[in-house]
């Protein structure tokens, strides 16, 4: 799925958005739409919880072999994150030992600070790929295979439950809309439903701090939506010429 690619990992700048849309264009001609089924989206392999601490650019993590193989290698690549320059003071006790057993680099003792001891699941930039869940089995699938926090109103349309991926797949006519929809989902990650923080050591942070200032208000999300729409419209206009 093209959103798994490195071009779509950081959707915070216009150039990155356009790059992502460009990368995803081949998907539009694919035989199967991104969300097959009778109006009910397939479970995404992208999970909100994969955005672990990606916006804290505080450390560099070495690459690690993944157990995934296959043509498009979803989640195979582990992005290196640039070491931050102006980090705040270390919490008491300093960083815990690195999980990979590697010796700390020359800078690590000072300003570069591993966040791995914050037990948020995966380290910075690390993708997580849960197995898809089909709770209703032989009956019509619900959108439950979607993480609960994905069940949200997006562009005026709530994800429908009950039709499910076992329904007839459409023939790809809605692929452009699906692309826009899924890019918006990836870019917005609106805070509805529980923001899972149960194993973070000091519980839930204030709402406006949850994304490190990246998504403090509803207003700040609007430009992203507009940006996507403009980019796609511009793209279609160029094609028309």
């Amino acid at each position: 799925w093209c959103l798994e690619s490195s071009q779509c990992q950081d959707l915070t700048t216009e150039s990155n958005l356009l790059e992502c849309i460009r990368a995803c264009k081949p998907d539009l001609s694919a035989e199967t739409p991104m969300f097959p089924g009778n109006g009910d989206e397939q479970p995404l392999t992208e999970n909100p919880r994969k955005y672990v601490m990606g916006h804290f650019r505080w450390d560099r993590f070495g690459r690690r072999n993944s157990s995934s193989s296959g043509s498009s290698g979803a989640g195979q690549k582990r992005e290196d994150v640039s070491a931050g320059e102006d980090c705040g003071p270390l919490p008491e006790g300093g960083p815990e030992p690195r999980s990979d057993g590697a010796k700390p680099g020359p800078r690590e003792g000072k300003r570069s600070y591993s966040m791995e001891h914050f037990r948020w699941g995966k380290p910075v930039g690390k993708k997580r790929r849960p197995v898809k869940v089909y709770p209703n089995g032989a009956e019509d699938e619900s959108a439950e295979a979607f993480p609960l926090e994905f069940k949200r109103e997006l562009t005026g349309q709530r994800l429908r439950e009950g039709d499910g991926p076992d329904g007839p797949a459409d023939d790809g006519a809605g692929a452009q809309a699906d692309l826009e929809h899924s890019l918006l989902v990836a870019a917005e990650k609106k805070d509805e439903g529980p923001y899972r923080m149960e194993h973070f050591r000091w519980g839930s942070p204030p709402k406006d701090k949850r994304y490190g200032g990246f998504m403090t208000s509803e207003k700040s999300q609007t430009p992203l939506v507009t940006l996507f729409k403009n980019a796609i419209i511009k793209n279609a206009y160029k094609k028309g010429e």
């Epitope: 199967t32 097959p36 690690r64 157990s67 979803a74 849960p130 197995v131 991926p165 076992d166």
Partner: antibody
Framework: EVQLVESGGGLVQPGGSLRLSCAAS?????????ICWVRQAPGKGLEWIGC????????YYASSAKGRFTMSRDNSKNTVYLQMNSLRAEDTAVYYC???????WGQGTLVTVSS | DIQMTQSPSTLSASVGDRVTITCQAS??????LAWYQQKPGKAPKLLIY???KLTSGVPSRFSGSGSGTEFTLTISSLQPDDFATYYC????????????FGGGTKVEIK
Amino acid sequence: EVQLVESGGGLVQPGGSLRLSCAASGFTVSSGYDICWVRQAPGKGLEWIGCIDTGSGNTYYASSAKGRFTMSRDNSKNTVYLQMNSLRAEDTAVYYCAKGISSIWGQGTLVTVSS
Amino acid sequence: DIQMTQSPSTLSASVGDRVTITCQASQTISSDLAWYQQKPGKAPKLLIYAASKLTSGVPSRFSGSGSGTEFTLTISSLQPDDFATYYCQTYYDIIDDGATFGGGTKVEIK
């Protein structure tokens, strides 16, 4: 009705190979589902072998299955495969395919590795 | 791969008893845990997913709880049909961690 049916099990000699099939009905494999393989040795617990995302073709394996076992799919036949090479006596088990995390499991096919 | 430790391995109980089975993950798996019931010669049946969500058609006497690394399956009042083997399974991350099963708990008649 949504169903999975395994086939291809049987008696094989140590060092031999076998390809198991998992035929899906009631849903279209190419739409992009996780189909997973799980085995159960006689009198033992369940052991996860791996999953294939039938949409992308991406495969994910248990550490113990890497190297000898390969999953693939044929969308035209609505079927997923498990190729098993260099089989050993300890691979003797009932092999199940399952649709992700669900109650949709095949009936299982017995693989016996013995000389 | 993540290790899933299930206990007890065998549990003797009577009809009407409250039964509790625990499952511990070797690292945090959030709520990505499923519970299955298996009877001899049959394929497993999904009871609970997302640690606490009951699959449709499963009696409400079954319940699941927990998150992070500690999980529990509870049968509030054991019925004759519940004598079986129960397995937990994580599905948190198949890229790095696999979808490991616990060792199983056989619930037998006392």
